[in-house]
């Protein structure tokens, strides 16, 4: 999937299987990614688990779990708030569109999470105070935490190189990372479809083009569109909403 | 160890900032400090071996001397409202202030800096 980190770095990651997206003293978010096509290096999110940890007199531990074709509007125990404590309503789930769009507000940590199902796969977006982002017991032992540190270099897909291949008339769009790409999606069509929804040629637009060329699945146009829309709602600095191409950083630079 | 609760209650009580209260706010600030000191003292049994506890104790001592607060005197009333009856329903609007990040954790400073992370597509 494509990842926009807390530090506004943009990466495309292979990260197949279960990976921690957020892991701090208040919250743990884990995603499971699966290949979009057999033999493809590109993956998309098929499962999402969010654990809100027990917090003072506010909330009991609550688990939210979403999978492909199952986007619940409640926590795993059936509740829609933080439990029996006095401050239980400082954690709330709201269903925006049944089976497609859920918003979780964790007021006790100033955090808003948006989970969507777009096509077969899930998208995730979060707004969180820096103080909460950095509330980790031991910075050194936190290991990989994708939203904070980005993906390891060996898990990144260089989609700028991929795009150069795709634009080149001498090479087919099916060049790496996916050996099984539908023939039906020429580069120009992908560009046109993405331009419809994403008029600014930023990295969301580039991600959209990449996804259409990689999968032939038009739902990924919507995924990029909603990711940008969620960014508009959740990003505190509207000037930084659109990210543009730059040389790729090492994962250390993301921390 | 509930020392963090003491910290956040102190921040919540000192809306004009924990480091430089206006001169006319000093009595109120000192009252909040005494409340903070009392709160930390009450956590001593369960926190006394932990760094957070000792940092709070030393921080209180420093702030008391900086603002010439006397050890004895009034304490500030906690802002948390009384708990509802045990049979209260799931719909509660009167959460303690500590359960509202913007009200509690950041009364002592400017609005928090928010960050955004997103994951989508392939």
């Amino acid at each position: 999937p494509h990842l926009r980190t807390f530090t506004d770095h943009f990466q495309t990651c292979k990260v197949q299987g279960a990976w921690p997206l957020i892991d701090n003293n208040y919250l743990n978010v884990q995603v499971t990614n699966t290949p979009v096509l057999p033999g493809s290096a590109a993956t998309a999110t098929s499962k999402l688990t969010i654990i809100f940890k027990n917090f003072q007199e506010c909330v009991d531990q609550k688990v939210y779990q979403a999978e492909m074709d199952e986007l619940p509007s409640a926590f795993a125990d059936g509740s829609k708030n933080g439990g029996d404590k006095h401050g239980a309503n400082s954690l709330k789930i709201t269903e925006k569109v049944s089976g497609q769009h859920v918003e979780i507000q964790a007021k006790y940590i100033g955090t808003t999470i948006v989970v969507r199902q777009v096509g077969r796969y899930l998208t995730f977006a979060v707004r969180m105070p820096e103080e909460v982002v950095n509330a980790v017991e031991d910075r050194d032992s936190q290991g990989l935490y994708l939203c904070l540190r980005g993906c390891p270099l060996n898990q990144q897909i260089d989609f700028q190189a991929f795009r150069a291949n795709a634009e080149s008339p001498r090479r087919p769009a099916a060049a790496s990372p996916s050996p099984v790409v539908p023939e039906t999606f020429p580069y120009e069509t992908a560009v046109a479809k993405c331009k419809e929804k994403l008029p600014v040629e930023d990295l969301y637009y580039q991600a959209c083009v990449f996804d259409l060329l990689t999968t032939g699945d038009v739902n990924f146009t919507l995924a990029a569109y909603y990711a940008l829309e969620d960014g508009k709602m959740l990003h505190s600095n509207k000037d930084k909403l659109h990210l543009f191409e730059r040389t790729r950083e090492l994962p250390g630079a993301v921390a | 160890c509930k020392i963090l609760k003491c910290n956040s209650e102190f921040w919540s009580a000192t809306s004009s900032g924990s480091h430089a209260p206006a001169s006319d706010d000093v009595p109120e600030f000192c009252a909040a400090l005494r409340t903070y000191a009392l709160c930390t003292r009450r956590t001593a049994r369960t926190c006394r071996g932990d760094l957070a506890y000792h940092s709070a104790v030393h921080g209180i001592e420093d702030l008391m001397s900086q603002h010439n607060c006397s050890k004895d005197g009034p304490t500030s009333q906690p802002r948390v409202r009384t708990l509802p009856p045990a049979g209260d329903s799931q719909e509660r609007s009167d959460s303690p202030e500590i359960c509202h990040y913007e009200k509690s954790f950041h009364k002592h400073s400017a609005a928090p800096n928010y960050t955004h992370c997103g994951l989508f597509g392939d």
Partner: antibody, heavy 115, light 112 residues
Framework: EVQLVESGGGLVQPGGSLRLSCAAS????????MNWIRQAPGKGLEWIGM????????HYADSVKGRFTISRDNSKNTLYLQMNSLRAEDTAVYYC????????WGQGTMVTVSS | DVVLTQSPLSLPVTLGQPASISCRSS???????????LEWFQQRPGQSPRLLIY???TRFSGVPDRFSGSGSGTDFTLKISRVEAEDVGVYYC?????????FGQGTKLEIK
């Protein structure tokens, strides 16, 4: 994830000495007081002692005072228990636990004092 | 030293039924500030102890809400609303109010 791993247990003769270690990870070790607790075979839990985050204070149970010493090396994220003048009644599983009041515990190491 | 006396020492319970363990202290566990520092630990067979409840009634992170603690002064209770198979083990109360800290002798919960 908080992890505490005790080591150094084994068989020792009465009057002998043993040094137990507890390797900590998953939290900022140097921020927390630490405890040692033991459990004799088939018996209940007995608190042995605790050490402050910076080693400035140590507290011991009367049963081990003067024989056992708790220390720590924050640079190595390790807690120690030096046990001298061991007796048969010191035979137990020894646990280290995080915090002034123990919240997370290690899996324990067995100490057998026997001739 | 403060002596904590648990009862019963053995507690056979039917799955799905409630269970209650008592812990009595030889002196009040209320501190001069009015706080009471009593905790409950669970030790499953072959495992290390795990914190369930602190400050008499506050559940520790990740502890199911079928566990609850109550009491004051010298009398305290741990309740399990519906016993599950994974609840089998020994339960200990632990006081932190007075030095030295002390444990109860343990209550063994088993399934009937």
């Amino acid at each position: 994830e908080v992890q505490l791993v005790e080591s150094g247990g084994g068989l020792v003769q009465p009057g002998g000495s043993l040094r137990l270690s507890c390797a900590a990870s998953g939290f900022t070790f140097s921020n927390y007081g630490m405890n040692w607790i033991r459990q004799a075979p088939g018996k209940g839990l007995e608190w042995i002692g605790m050490i402050y985050y910076d080693s400035s204070e140590k507290h011991y149970a009367d049963s081990v005072k003067g024989r056992f010493t708790i220390s720590r090396d924050n640079s190595k994220n390790t807690l120690y228990l030096q046990m001298n003048s061991l007796r048969a009644e010191d035979t137990a599983v020894y646990y280290c636990a995080k915090g002034t009041t123990p919240d997370y515990w290690g899996q324990g190491t067995m100490v057998t004092v026997s001739s | 030293d403060v002596v904590l006396t648990q009862s019963p020492l053995s507690l056979p319970v039917t799955l799905g039924q409630p269970a209650s363990i008592s812990c009595r202290s030889s002196q009040s566990l209320e501190s001069s500030d009015g706080d009471t520092f009593l905790e409950w630990f669970q030790q499953r067979p072959g495992q290390s102890p795990r914190l369930l409840i602190y400050d008499v009634s506050t559940r520790f992170s990740g502890v199911p809400d079928r566990f609850s603690g109550s009491g004051s002064g010298t009398d305290f209770t741990l309740k399990i609303s519906r016993v599950e198979a994974e609840d089998v083990g020994v339960y200990y109360c632990f006081q932190v109010t007075h030095d030295p800290v002390t444990f109860g002798q343990g209550t063994k919960l088993e399934i009937k």
